[in-house]
Amino acid sequence: LQDPCSNCPAGTFCDNNRNQICSPCPPNSFSSAGGQRTCDICRQCKGVFRTRKECSSTSNAECDCTPGFHCLGAGCSMCEQDCKQGQELTKKGCKDCCFGTFNDQKRGICRPWTNCSLDGKSVLVNGTKERDVVCGP
């Protein structure tokens, strides 16, 4: 026998209190697939998170981060503080890259300059905190 709940489309739930008819998801909830017996509570984008896409009856809200922060993790589960180019984020805040390392982004860690000599090349342009060295012939 076919499960009557399988006829319930996204945006509804199979309502056991009403002889398994399809009832609409209440506001602030959604069901993204058919045949669900409950709806899922919408994600709230609060604090450092801001709403990129509103929740609808068939899809969850999507968050991103307020200016000065960037997303980390699946579905932007965390917001991390931006730093300037030439810096990296530490437990004590944004710190300049140490000599011999660089970061050309507002996120991530400082990485060592390329060692040109490993490829038998010489340094054409010196590296900075913000830029890698440029190797030449």
């Epitope: 739930f13 209190n17 209440p26 409950t38 899922d40 509570i41």
Partner: nanobody, 122 residues
Framework: EVQLLESGGGLVQPGGSLRLSCAAS????????VGWVRQAPGKGLEWVSA????????YYAESVKGRFTISRDNAKNTLYLQMSSLRAEDTAVYYC???????????????RGQGTQVTVSS
């Protein structure tokens, strides 16, 4: 026992107003997420409006925005729906609804009352 008793429906001309009431017993309205759903003749249930306990955020269906206002009186344990600029398409049975949160993290809703009939016709 949780009970929801709707009242205030009736026959009204297009452009008219009504105020629906929902008297709650067996639970404290101010601690719950509640709202109004309606069922038009031959149609399925449709959410009209809701008011959420956390901060009292309100939600309205696009079709009623700017015309309907949801509110509650915590002292009277009563939920209201002020309906104005009524249209023929607002004709339906209106039910008071209470959110039901499940252990697995999902949400459904419960309508315990008989509903109140609103008919918009000239």
């Amino acid at each position: 026992e949780v009970q929801l008793l709707e009242s205030g429906g009736g026959l009204v001309q297009p452009g008219g107003s009504l105020r629906l009431s929902c008297a709650a017993s067996g639970f404290t309205l101010s601690h719950e997420d509640v709202g109004w759903v309606r069922q038009a003749p031959g149609k399925g249930l449709e959410w009209v409006s809701a008011i959420l306990d956390s901060g009292g955020s309100t939600y309205y269906a696009e079709s009623v925005k700017g015309r309907f206002t949801i509110s509650r009186d915590n002292a009277k344990n009563t939920l209201y729906l002020q309906m104005s600029s009524l249209r023929a398409e607002d004709t339906a049975v209106y039910y008071c609804a209470r959110y039901v949160y499940h252990a697995g993290g999902g949400v459904t809703f419960d309508t315990r009352g008989q509903g109140t009939q609103v008919t918009v016709s000239s």
